[in-house]
């Protein structure tokens, strides 16, 4: 004869567990069904009534079959530096994450507690490694040949124009000026300039570069103090 | 937390070499620049170069090009200045600060080495 | 080089006090303008560093603000822990600090 499918609630036999979506009552010292997502024990069942579940309130939420007297409260809303990517439901929590420009510095299980600015590389630094979710931007020094003259999360250091004949020769946060109407070529396309090993050495005197962007020998002028960067912006 | 520890006060005779340290801890080293700056008895601070761990790339002020050379060892978390051809007047207290490339500049700082140079 | 002329590079003042220190820069330094207390042996301390950005746990009454090439710090009323001497420090282009204003009580 085939088993008999026991309902709710009943006794286990000896050694055995409850099914699946099912718990042991210790008091009743019977399986009893748990109630779903969205819903909590409103009543807990005894020897002859099973669980009986009630909706979960407003701001509040189960997300597995459960047995709990009580719904979770949902997170707090999201702060001015987060958003919500999860809404609040009967079933879910909420789920807030950084908003575009922030990385999180403090995660929670699900979400971020801590939200932080990307860092910013100022003039005469570009991003090394760009932020993720979960990490921040680090900014490393242009290499000799390169520059940035922008505060930003996002900007790499980018390489001196070339000229026919330097005007003013590039620093690492100002690009060379030309005294001919324009350059004669600048990267070669496709080339990423991120900060990257040089010799050590001050960064005031500006290396013969490699051959593949050899400029005329006027551009190798030892680099003296030169005004800002016109273009550069504050924070 | 942010620590920099740097090495113990030393005196020198003129014409010698000194070499700080500065060790490093409670963040990723190789993310920030290491500086160095000095300050003579009650006078002000001056800038004397920086040094990024990660590459070894460095800028030095003017002044110090010729004698100063700017180290890092990543294995141990630690920058180094060597200042050579002492003289009596770079008699001074020797810092060292991070610097995250931001415009937050110089957020932590060693405790000072004192550099005493004297016939 | 950019050079940072800071005055006065002495104040006497009372507890309570409003207290100004300025910075002239030679050049345009933007907004990269840093300020810097340091107290007798102990090693400097950022207070304010892109002209108007109050680092973490540095008290309200410590304020930055500018005016073309000439920067201020403010302390809006001086307490007795705020005696001592004040740097700023330009790097915007290559670093440079100003002399110094050193604070006493009155």
């Known amino acids: 004869l085939p088993a008999q499918v026991a309902f709710t609630p009943y006794a286990p036999e000896p050694g055995s567990t409850c099914r699946l979506r099912e718990y042991y009552d210790q008091t009743a010292q019977m399986c009893c069904s748990k109630c779903s997502p969205g819903q909590h024990a409103k009543v807990f069942c005894t020897k002859t009534s099973d669980t009986v579940c009630d909706s979960c309130e407003d701001s509040t939420y189960t997300q597995l079959w459960n047995w709990v007297p009580e719904c979770l409260s949902c997170g707090s809303r999201c702060s001015s530096d987060q958003v919500e990517t999860q809404a609040c439901t009967r079933e879910q929590n909420r789920i807030c994450t950084c908003r575009p420009g922030w990385y999180c510095a403090l995660s929670k299980q699900e979400g971020c507690r801590l939200c932080a600015p990307l860092r910013k590389c100022r003039p005469g630094f570009g991003v090394a490694r760009p932020g993720t979710e979960t990490s921040d931007v680090v900014c490393k020094p242009c290499a000799p040949g390169t520059f940035s003259n922008t505060t930003s999360s996002t900007d790499i250091c980018r390489p001196h124009q070339i000229c026919n004949v330097v005007a003013i020769p590039g620093n690492a946060s100002m690009d060379a000026v030309c005294t001919s109407t324009s350059p004669t070529r600048s990267m070669a396309p496709g080339a990423v300039h991120l900060p990257q090993p040089v010799s050590t050495r001050s960064q005031h005197t500006q290396p013969t570069p490699e051959p593949s962007t050899a400029p005329s020998t006027s551009f190798l002028l030892p680099m003296g103090p030169s005004p800002p960067a016109e273009g550069s912006t504050g924070d | 937390q942010v620590q920099l520890v740097q090495s113990g006060a030393e005196v020198k005779k003129p014409g010698a070499s000194v070499k700080v340290s500065c060790k490093a801890s409670g963040y990723t080293f190789t993310d920030y620049i290491i500086h160095w700056v000095r300050q003579a008895p009650g006078q002000g601070l001056e800038w004397m170069g920086w040094i990024d761990p990660d590459y070894g790339n460095t800028d030095y002020a003017d002044k110090f090009k010729k004698r100063v050379t700017m180290t890092a060892d990543t294995s141990i978390s630690t920058a180094f200045m060597e200042l050579s051809r002492l003289r009596s007047d770079d008699t001074a207290v020797y810092y060292c600060?991070?610097?995250?490339?931001?415009?937050?500049?110089?957020?932590?700082w060693g405790q000072g080495t004192l550099v005493t140079v004297s016939s | 080089d950019i050079q940072m002329t800071q005055s006065p590079s002495s104040l006497s003042a009372s507890v309570g006090d409003r207290v100004t220190i300025t910075c002239q820069g030679s050049q345009n330094i933007d907004n990269y303008l840093a300020w810097f207390q340091q107290k007798p042996g102990k090693a400097p301390k950022l207070l304010i560093y892109s002209t108007y950005s109050l680092q973490t746990g540095v008290p309200s009454r410590f304020s930055g603000s500018r005016s073309g090439t000439d920067f201020t710090l403010t302390i809006s009323s001086l307490q007795p822990e705020d005696f001592a001497t004040y740097f700023c420090?330009?790097?915007?282009?290559?670093?440079?600090f100003g002399g110094g204003t050193k604070l006493e009580l009155k």
């Open positions: 600060a991070r610097d995250d490339a931001s415009p937050l500049v110089m957020d932590a």
């Open positions: 420090f330009q790097y915007n282009n290559g670093y440079m």
